[in-house]
């Protein structure tokens, strides 16, 4: 039996003969911009861009159903034009066109905002682009804008605006000595400004021998006033008021003195936590310091909250190291020796590509990154000792590691 006439749109046919008898063959080639869709018994078996397929007449039926479908470029995205939204009323197949509009605050540069779906399934190269601009930068609390042009609304990516912190404020992160007041922010690729900030200048805490004796109006921040109340005898002795004021340069305008009535010495520190040793070469008078040390090799003296013991320190707790205690004018030791404990110090093998269980805690900077795949230099965690469990003591615990970032928790992977 002869096969029906072979008709394929957007294709050229090359048949072995004009007859369509059993065994006759035709080669089907799609026109440029179209792809072959090959079906057998109505089931798609292949989709190919080229170059051709041969069909055979078998018992009155062509052995494959062939169609030439236009190439689909799919909806364009930011890879074609950054900061644009696209409209494709004609669809996204070969020959159709999409237009784009720039998303605020980006602006069109060029005049042809059309893309054409090309024969290779790619969009034509854009003849215009969306140039990102920043609006006027937002006000920075406690800072003055120094660049006049920055009050306008159009700023190219990469342009800067200069600010200066108001008196009594400084740029965070600048050193205590050189409290920087001027800073710049930059218009970034996504049309937003880099963040800038001004934080209040702070003074150093008063000497520890006055701990617990003073009250301050606003902590140790600029303009705060700290006061120790002395009995009236001080004034009659000509010592003046025991008040200090934090100045805008981060220094106190004076210093506290020990009130007349504050006399005596601290009690001998006893009932120390295990392995802790105090050495008090200058005795126990007000202002005397005792050096803290631990009897165990490579243990360190640290302060723990009242309810935490050395045995149950959670890995995320980063206790403060302490080197000395001071006898305050209130005749109390500061910090209180009962809060000082000895913990195992960090082994000196951080950042060496082995996850040392003993160092896998905040106190030891999570072994310098050796316990997380994202931070270990070799990108492979090797536990030490070898018996250490990668789900236990050698698990990735560092909260800063990529493994614990919000993105990862949502199932995204990082490139």
């Amino acid at each position: 039996t002869d096969c029906p006439e072979l008709a394929v749109e957007n294709a050229s046919l090359n048949c072995s003969s004009s007859d369509r008898y059993h065994g006759a063959q035709c080669t089907v080639s799609c026109r440029t911009g179209y792809v072959l869709q090959i079906r057998r018994d109505d089931e798609l078996i292949k989709s190919q861009t080229g170059p051709s397929v041969t069909v055979t007449c078998t018992e009155g039926k062509w052995n494959k159903q062939v169609a030439c479908e236009p190439v689909d470029c799919s909806i364009p995205d930011h890879h074609q034009v950054y900061a644009a939204s696209f409209s494709c009323p004609e669809g996204t197949t070969f020959g159709s066109q999409c237009s784009f509009q720039c998303r605020h605050p980006a602006q069109l540069k060029g005049n042809n905002s059309l893309l054409t779906c090309m024969e290779d399934g790619l969009w034509s190269f854009p003849e215009a682009l969306c140039e990102l601009m920043c609006l006027a930068p937002p006000p920075v609390p406690n800072a003055d804008l120094q660049t006049a042009r920055c009050r306008e609304n159009k700023h190219k990516v990469g342009s800067f605006c200069k600010y200066k912190c108001k008196p009594g404020y400084h740029v965070p992160g600048s050193s205590r000595k050189s409290k920087k007041r001027a800073f710049k922010t930059q218009c970034t690729q996504d049309g937003s400004w880099q963040e800038g900030a001004c934080v209040p200048v702070t003074c150093d805490p008063p000497p520890p021998k006055f701990h617990g004796l003073y009250q301050c109006t606003n902590g140790f921040q600029f303009n705060s006033e700290c006061r120790i109340k002395c009995e009236d005898s001080d004034a009659s002795q000509g010592l003046g008021s025991n008040v200090i004021h934090c100045r805008k340069d981060g220094t106190w305008n004076g210093s506290f003195h020990v009130c007349q009535e504050m006399q005596g010495q601290c009690s001998v520190p006893n009932e120390l936590n295990s392995n802790l040793k105090l050495q008090c070469p200058d005795g126990y008078a007000i202002g005397s310091e005792c050096a803290t040390s631990c009897l165990d090799h490579n243990s360190e003296s640290i302060i723990l909250p009242m309810n935490v013991t050395v045995r149950d320190i959670p890995h995320w707790l980063n206790p403060t190291r302490v080197e000395r205690v001071v006898c305050t004018a209130g005749l109390k030791w500061y910090p209180h020796p009962a809060l000082i404990h000895c913990v195992k110090g960090c082994e000196p093998f951080m950042g060496d590509n082995y996850c040392d269980a003993i160092n896998n805690r905040a106190f030891c900077n999570y072994d310098g990154g050796d316990c997380c795949t994202s931070t270990v230099k070799t990108k492979k965690v090797t536990p030490f000792p070898m018996s250490c469990d990668l789900q236990g003591d050698c698990a990735c615990r560092d909260p800063q590691a990529q493994e614990h970032s919000r993105k990862d928790l949502r199932g995204y992977s990082h490139g």
Epitope: H297, N298, C346, P348, F349, M350, G351, P385
Partner: antibody, heavy 123, light 107 residues
């Protein structure tokens, strides 16, 4: 060639100070923890001190704690041992040694040693 | 601190002999033990790490065994260049401690 070369030894009176240096070459010094190990004449090896790759962590043997200070200058590829309040029992050959962790399990070893420098504490 | 005890402190042997040196730790150290060889006037040299692994370049006549507290260094057939002092060292944790040494002398 991987090499450690100590210097700074000599004769010193009890109570005085001395600073030893160890110059490293042929490897990335700033990636390794380093040690000082000493050997009294005719005696065995005694570990003295260790310093982490970046100098942030230091530990000492009880016999030298509070008197000796280990330090390093990674820009100069040099390890130091500052020895104060020296005693007769500190007389020894002082070796610097590289701390290597051998794969795959990370065993701790002293894999490269210097030739040593002799410190004699005597009045 | 972990104490390391070596025995014997010295031994005399001939070329070709099988030599065994033992080392005992005051507490369990798993397999975290190294052996070093030191010749007169020279720096120590790492022979064996992890109780039994041979450091690269060290002849196969040297072998180590043991775990926990008891360890052994064996030289299967003593060669002239093997006359030296041998030290064990625990690498379980700071402070690193060495054994007192075993001097291998020519008989």
């Amino acid at each position: 060639e991987v090499q450690l070369v100590e210097s700074g030894g000599g004769v010193v009176q009890p109570g005085r100070s001395l600073r030893l240096s160890c110059a490293a070459s042929g490897f990335t010094f700033s990636s390794y923890a380093m040690h000082w190990v000493r050997q009294a004449p005719g005696k065995g090896l005694e570990w003295v001190a260790v310093i982490s790759y970046d100098g942030s962590i230091k530990y000492y043997a009880d016999a030298v704690k509070g008197r000796f200070t280990i330090s390093r200058d990674n820009s100069k590829n040099t390890l130091y041992l500052q020895m104060n309040s020296l005693r007769a029992e500190d007389t020894a050959v002082y070796y610097c040694a590289r701390h290597e962790r051998i794969p795959p399990w990370g065993f701790h070893t002293f894999d490269i040693w210097g030739q040593g420098t002799l410190v004699t504490v005597s009045s | 601190d972990i104490q390391m005890t070596q025995s014997p402190s010295s031994l005399s042997a001939s070329v070709g002999d099988r030599v065994t040196i033992t080392c005992r730790a005051s507490q369990g150290i798993s397999i975290y033990l190294n052996w070093y060889q030191q010749k007169p006037g020279k720096a120590p040299k790492l022979l064996i790490y992890g109780a039994s692994s041979l450091q690269s370049g060290v002849p196969s006549r040297f072998s180590g065994s043991g775990s926990g507290t008891d360890f052994t260094l064996t030289i299967s057939s003593l060669q002239p260049e093997d006359f030296a002092t041998y030290y064990c060292q625990q690498s379980d944790g700071t402070p690193w401690t060495f054994g007192g040494g075993t001097k291998v002398e020519i008989k």
